[in-house]
Interface confidence: low
Amino acid sequence: SDKLYQRKEPVISSVHTKVKGIAEVTENVTEGGVTKLGHSIFDTADYTFPLQGNSFFVMTNYVKSEGQVQTLCPEYPRRGAQCSSDRRCKKGWMDPQSKGIQTGRCVPYDKTRKTCEVSAWCPTEEEKEAPRPALLRSAENFTVLIKNNIHFPGHNYTTRNILPTMNGSCTFHKTWDPQCSIFRLGDIFQEAGENFTEVAVQGGIMGIEIYWDCNLDSWSHHCRPRYSFRRLDDKNTDESFVPGYNFRYAKYYKENNVEKRTLIKAFGIRFDILVFGTGGKF
């Protein structure tokens, strides 16, 4: 309740997160013309990426373009990219939608289609749908530890969400353990009324709100966080211009003294931790 006699001050906060969990990924791997099931293990270093600010990212799905080298090749025949003669291809032109610089030649992409040749990382990335179900759908069972230190400088008061008495094996529950700062990712989605399995395919942005409503008067002192969760991105993926949340990164390597890379389009959940609140004191 609002205490008008108190001097209020907004919270100053710092956040640190640690994600834990292992995922086993099974996907089709084509080698030597033979497609077989490949099994790989993903640990924290494979699926999380350091982000700036109060955010962390968990990869839930991906599309790989393996063995790319810098050379000349036909660009991917996306809509409007096909050509029938060199006239359609402009030397030195960099189409923002393309993956390279045009050489001015119209060349066969495959037996039926021709596209402009580009100087690029080849073969150019194909426009593939994100795998369904998501490859790292088991990320639902990952946990994140959120460390949140707060400070009210005007009141010379500092505290944090993790208390010395807290059990390191607890899991947050709105009713049974509302002060535990270890959250199961699937539970976060459930609390926000979202389906993790569905969002994991294209990715999304989830907000973790930490609200501090602190009464710093010694006779009725109370300063503990309240956690709530809501989805922040446009969930109507069919209607939104660029659905979900994804980015690309590359792993570089040398093979027979030729620099190559594997391009990975990573889909996943960006968790934004939003800390707000006030501290009041007479």
Partner: nanobody
Framework: EVQLVESGGGLVQPGGSLRLSCSAS??????????MGWFRQAPGKELEFVAA????????YYADSVKGRFTISRHNPRNTVYLQMNSLRPEDTAVYYC?????????????????????WGQGTQVTVSS
């Protein structure tokens, strides 16, 4: 100097199988970043594309006439490409040539064009007859 050496040809009855091998050697040749292909030439006919396997991602390509019957594969550590030929027909009779396209020619996928390939083997004879 790059050398491609084919083996595995011979005489086989219709419906039978053969496995052709092609090994690549040579200091300047980067096998694992090359497109490898098989072509064939029947007496009095033009050189015909049979199958190819991409340098970068093991993608395979086949002529319509051999789809479902022939399988191309490669073994990088041994610098060898294979052509497994099943359900052979008399019209498959030809000299089979192994060809390689090194990355220095660019990554363009003209896999069914002989002009793409800059290295060729001497050929191995395949005869399908009863």
């Amino acid at each position: 100097e790059v050398q491609l050496v084919e083996s595995g040809g011979g005489l086989v009855q219709p419906g039978g199988s053969l496995r052709l091998s092609c090994s690549a050697s040579g200091r300047t040749f980067s096998f694992s970043t090359s497109t490898m292909g098989w072509f064939r030439q029947a007496p009095g006919k033009e050189l015909e594309f049979v199958a190819a396997i991409d340098w970068s991602d093991f993608n395979t390509y086949y002529a319509d006439s051999v789809k479902g019957r022939f399988t191309i594969s490669r073994h990088n550590p041994r610098n060898t490409v294979y052509l497994q030929m099943n359900s052979l027909r008399p019209e498959d009779t030809a000299v089979y040539y192994c060809a390689a396209h090194s990355e220095t020619r660019g990554g363009t996928r003209y896999f069914d064009r002989p002009s793409l390939y800059n290295y060729w083997g001497q050929g191995t004879q395949v005869t399908v007859s009863s």
